[in-house]
Interface confidence: low
């Protein structure tokens, strides 16, 4: 018996087609992805093959203005239109709190939404009961397939799930659910979830009875043969893991942003054992036409976005200096504003010992592309912010050693004075540079804001300590020459859309007046650490 699994993950509100790098589509003949194009390909495969499942491994939420305006209603509407068979909850599905998941998505989706390792307690338990499930048995042709879901247990640090959801260890939570499916005589089981490729492989190895793992969160691109676009494969598709009980378990993921449709064919014997598996992600490029009816629907929903982008989010009573003359040479108040928004967006009081889990932000000055003039009645719109942050990036959470941060700050000024983008703007950090010293030895003071304290204060950076830092995905990936971040980071979790983070902060504050306040200083006398 042959099953075709079609899968997406980490789509991050790319409902419309995008450019090759998943930013705004400029030249339509070269654009990719989008739900209208995805639907064309899915329908083509459904017509050609008998047993097809369309699955999503989480993080549909968050990423473009679509999510900012529609808050998840767009996800339910278009996933329903594409007739998804199941979805696992990702960490970003909790970005607007549990209510922001229940109302627009869980109550509106016509397909099961799954996670076995999230347990509700207190008053939420009855409210959310039945709206998401640990597993679902789906009839496919003449057979049944069990799908068990899982979600990153780091979600409380990455999003806003509140205090009434407990995120358990994935493997511990999955095993009893798989065992339950076995007792129901379901012998073909897919684990569908959102914990990253390393956890996907562990699940394949450790959870007895799982036949296939379909994952997300780490935006992993797997491919067999010559890859069709810019993404470099992390391994073959499917990636085969030998389980502890000796079975060969295929593990798949399909990069991110709806650029590819994962396509996996599995052959099962009559006892539900996997005999063979093969496939590849399908690049959704312009050779695949956009479905006209879905496209028309997208255009109808688009109208509200255009209206939204010119509405006032809040006001500034000071000039927001995002000029390259400032942000690439010294502390600029636009950099301070953005970093303050990044920290504010990551407030998670998950431990009484810590006022927050993260206090530090770094931001390459070259990523700030425009100032905002306060003399337009102080109005700030989404459109204004899109000029400041035009690259469609995310503000991510990383863990770095102090020694890596020190290298990053040395890199920040290694060729100071040439208006280069690597000069860092900061939050929760006080840095002093001495430019009379040679490159690589210019940081004379680096103090960081404590997290394990009731009154936050600045302490000297410790080289061997591990720190959490919020930064643009561009820096996490080693951009602007910050190779040391990419090479030495200990953990990296993708965050929220950059513009959305700043717009939410401005809406919350209503009136802003960021100052230049001595976060970055220059000195010619020598300090000692």
């Amino acid at each position: 018996w042959e099953l075709t699994i079609l899968h997406t993950n980490d789509v991050h509100s790319r409902l419309e087609q995008t450019s090759e790098d998943s930013s705004k589509c400029v030249n339509a003949s070269r654009c990719m992805g989008g739900v209208a194009r995805l639907f064309t390909k899915v329908q083509q495969i459904r017509r050609a093959e008998p047993n097809v499942l369309l699955l999503d491994a989480g993080d549909q939420y968050q990423g473009t203005i679509w999510f900012t305006v529609y808050k998840g209603a767009e996800v339910a509407h278009f996933m329903n239109a594409l007739r998804y068979d199941a979805m696992a909850l990702g960490n970003h599905e909790f970005d607007n709190g549990v209510e922001g998941l229940i109302e627009p998505l869980l109550k509106e989706a016509k397909f099961p939404i799954l996670s076995a390792n999230i347990k509700a307690k207190g008053p939420l338990a009855s409210q959310i009961s039945g709206l998401y499930l640990p597993y679902k048995v789906l009839p496919v042709g003449d057979e049944v397939v069990g799908i068990v879901g899982y979600t990153s247990k780091e979600t409380p640090f990455l999003s806003n799930p509140g205090t009434n959801l407990v995120f358990e260890d994935e493997i511990t939570a999955l095993q009893p659910e798989v065992d339950k499916l076995k007792t129901l005589n379901v012998n073909k089981i897919i684990a569908l979830g959102h914990s990253g490729f390393e956890m996907d492989k562990l699940i394949a190895q450790k959870v007895r009875g799982v036949d296939v793992v379909v994952g997300g969160h780490s935006n992993t691109f797997l491919y067999t043969g010559n890859p069709p676009s810019k993404e470099v494969p992390a391994g073959k598709y499917p990636f085969i893991v030998t389980s502890d009980d000796g079975r060969k378990v295929p593990v798949v993921q399909a990069y991110a942003f709806g650029k590819y449709l994962g396509y996996l064919k599995i052959e099962f014997d009559e006892r539900g054992n996997v005999i063979s598996s093969h496939g590849n992600p399908i690049l959704l490029n312009s050779s695949i036409p956009e479905d006209p009816s879905i496209k028309a629907d997208i255009n109808k929903w688009r109208i509200k976005l255009d209206n939204y982008s010119t509405q006032e989010l809040g006001k500034t009573i000071v000039y927001l200096d995002g000029s390259s003359q400032s942000c690439r040479f010294r502390e600029c108040n636009m950099g301070n504003l953005i970093c303050d928004a990044m920290i504010n967006n990551n407030l998670r009081h998950t431990d009484e010992m810590f006022w927050n889990h993260v206090s530090m932000c770094i931001l390459n000055g070259g990523g700030i592309r425009s100032p905002i003039d306060e003399r337009n009645n102080g109005t700030i719109t989404w459109e204004n912010l899109a000029a400041v942050l035009p690259f469609g990036g995310t503000f991510d959470l990383v863990q770095l050693k102090g020694s890596t941060l020190k290298k990053a700050f040395e890199h920040s000024v290694h060729r100071y004075g040439q208006s280069t983008g690597e000069f860092l703007q900061v939050g929760g950090i006080h840095v002093v540079y001495d430019l009379s010293r040679k490159p690589g030895d210019r940081v004379v003071k680096l103090d960081v804001l404590c997290t394990k304290c009731r009154v936050p204060s600045y302490d000297p950076l410790k080289m061997d300590e591990v720190y959490k830092v919020i930064l643009p995905n561009f820096l996490a990936n080693g951009g602007d020459g910050f190779q040391m971040i990419k090479d030495e980071l200990l953990r990296h979790d993708s965050g929220d859309q950059d513009i959305n983070v700043v717009s939410t902060y401005i809406s919350k504050m209503k009136v802003i007046y960021p100052a230049v306040e001595g976060r970055i200083k220059f000195s010619h006398h020598h300090h000692h650490h």
Epitope: V232, G478, G479
Partner: nanobody, 113 residues
Framework: QVKLQESGGGRVQTGGSLRLSCAAS????????MYWYRQAPGEQRQLVAL???????YYVDSVKGRFTISRDDSKNTVYLQMNDLKPEDTAVYFC???????WGQGTQVTVSS
């Protein structure tokens, strides 16, 4: 296993040009910053130029305006176009992704006056 193969060196007169190539394997080339270094006899290896995954470039002052670094992600190759060569450019030239990887053999550039 990272493998780096430099080529294109040679002997030229002052004011001449060379184009160095470096073919890389075993790395996720398109998401990696690539560097050119050089080592003159009896001296430490020093950075010449780098190009990030987004195509941003950096040059040391001594080569600025004369050398151009570029990359072709489809070929997993980084190039160094060297114009207006001077005797002080004489060195073995190496490419690398992460400084700290094993080095390739390098390619010798000799500029005679």
């Amino acid at each position: 296993q990272v493998k780096l193969q430099e080529s294109g060196g040679g002997r030229v007169q002052t004011g001449g040009s060379l184009r160095l190539s470096c073919a890389a394997s075993g790395i996720s080339f398109s998401i990696t910053t690539m560097y050119w270094y050089r080592q003159a006899p009896g001296e430490q290896r020093q950075l010449v130029a780098l190009i990030t995954d987004r195509g941003n470039t950096y040059y040391v002052d001594s080569v600025k305006g004369r050398f151009t670094i570029s990359r072709d992600d489809s070929k997993n190759t980084v190039y160094l176009q060297m114009n207006d060569l001077k005797p002080e450019d004489t060195a073995v030239y190496f490419c690398n992704s992460i400084p700290g990887n094993d080095w390739g053999q390098g390619t010798q550039v000799t500029v005679s006056s």
